[in-house]
């Protein structure tokens, strides 16, 4: 009996009720491998999901997220709301990053600015809600008499562009 079932190709199932006949998968279902005892129900891309690839008798549907959302989890199992750069998603919606943190993407959490002094460096460009700080040479490298091929750019205030 098992041997008869192993002959059933993808897109069919081995029908125990009909003496191991290979029956085609019914509408809205698929089998991606041969020898299956059942066809599986196609995934449906509804709500915040949109269809990237339609279901066929041999392969499941694939979903993406609609505009304003991004995929999470294996095979886009969840859609999470996008936020702007400089924000993170909380239970109450998108919130600006707290001072000292940044997020340069539409997803994920706000992360602390790099602490330049831990590497013995100085802040070259201040951080913003959207961007991490840029670390420059160490203060010692900037002391009088130290050689530097290019003078360091002046540090600027968060959100300001150089004049």
């Amino acid at each position: 009996l098992q041997d008869l079932c192993s002959n059933c190709p993808a897109g069919t199932f081995c029908d125990n009720n009909r003496s191991q006949i290979c029956s085609p998968c019914p509408p809205n279902s698929f089998s991606s491998a041969g020898g299956q005892r059942t066809c599986d129900i196609c995934r449906q891309c509804k709500g915040v999901f949109k269809t990237r690839k339609e279901c066929s008798s041999t392969s499941n549907a694939e979903c993406d997220c609609i505009s304003g959302y991004h995929c999470l989890g294996a095979e886009c199992s969840m859609c999470e709301q996008d936020c702007k750069q400089g924000q993170e998603l909380t239970k109450k919606g998108c919130k600006d990053c707290c001072f000292g943190t940044f997020n340069d993407q539409k997803r994920g959490i706000c992360r602390p600015w790099t602490n330049c002094s831990l590497d013995g460096k100085s802040v070259l460009v201040n951080g913003t809600k959207e961007r991490d700080v840029v670390c420059g040479p160490s203060p010692a490298d900037l002391s009088p008499g130290a050689s530097s091929a290019t003078p360091p750019a002046p540090a600027r205030e968060p959100g300001h562009s150089p004049q």
Epitope: N17, P26, A33, T38, C39
Partner: antibody, heavy 121, light 106 residues
């Protein structure tokens, strides 16, 4: 005879998780799909999702995608459902039910006795 | 999702009476399954694929219908038929159930 035996009643606090089991006997576990259903007091029966124990493939009612996780252990012929972030509306009887794997009709021919979950602070 | 509406919600019948329970679908479905549930028990498979009686179901029960309208009929109702009857579809994901018809036998 064919039987589905479910784990005992659970009382949980809001925000907690619960994992219930459904042990199958009397048939070949991998030849049938296992479905989970919810029956809340005074509400209609709701389908949560199913697992194909042969492949591990799962398909969920979108209403439960975020909080229900279905798994199966072929070695013990047991299916599991974990429900997370519990709230009072999750208070219900949860049933496992098998569907004939060689039928295209998706008909629940055998049901477990149900697991009662009470969510209360 | 496909919504199944059962009518009536509640029916009272006397023994030997003919009882008809209707299940209407919001969109056309290929077939309907029926389940019987008694208080304190799990639902039981009763009729599959519109008209096939499950093992052990008395022949006084029958099922019929197509498209959006389906019926479960009990020809000469008996006291043991007192229960709630549910219809179910899977022509479209997700599986959905009617909210049940409670049958009381006087």
């Amino acid at each position: 005879q064919v039987q589905l035996v479910q784990s005992g009643a659970e009382v949980k606090k809001p925000g907690a998780s619960v994992k219930m089991s459904c042990k199958a006997s009397g048939y070949t576990f991998t030849f049938y799909t296992m479905h989970w259903l919810k029956q809340a007091p005074g509400q209609c029966l709701e389908w949560i999702g199913y697992i194909n124990p042969s492949s591990g493939y799962t398909n969920y009612n979108q209403k439960f995608t975020d909080r229900a996780t279905l798994t199966a252990d072929k070695s013990t012929s047991t299916a599991y459902m974990e429900l997370s972030s519990l709230r009072s509306e999750d208070t219900a009887v949860y049933y496992c039910a098998r569907s004939d794997g060689s039928s295209s009709k998706w008909y629940f021919d055998v049901w477990g006795q149900g697991t009662t979950v009470t969510v209360s602070s | 999702e496909i919504v199944l509406t059962q009518s009536p919600d509640f029916q009272s019948a006397t023994p030997k009476e003919k009882v008809t329970i209707t299940c209407r679908a919001s969109s056309s479905v290929s077939y309907i399954h029926w389940y019987q549930q008694k208080p304190g028990s799990s639902p039981k498979a009763w009729i599959s694929a519109t008209s096939n009686l499950a093992s052990g179901v008395p022949s006084r029960f029958s099922g019929s219908g197509s498209g959006t309208s389906y019926t479960l009929t009990i020809n000469r109702v008996e006291a043991e038929d007192a229960a709630t009857y549910y219809c179910q579809q899977w022509s479209s994901n997700p599986f959905t159930f009617g909210c049940g018809t409670k049958l009381e036998i006087k």
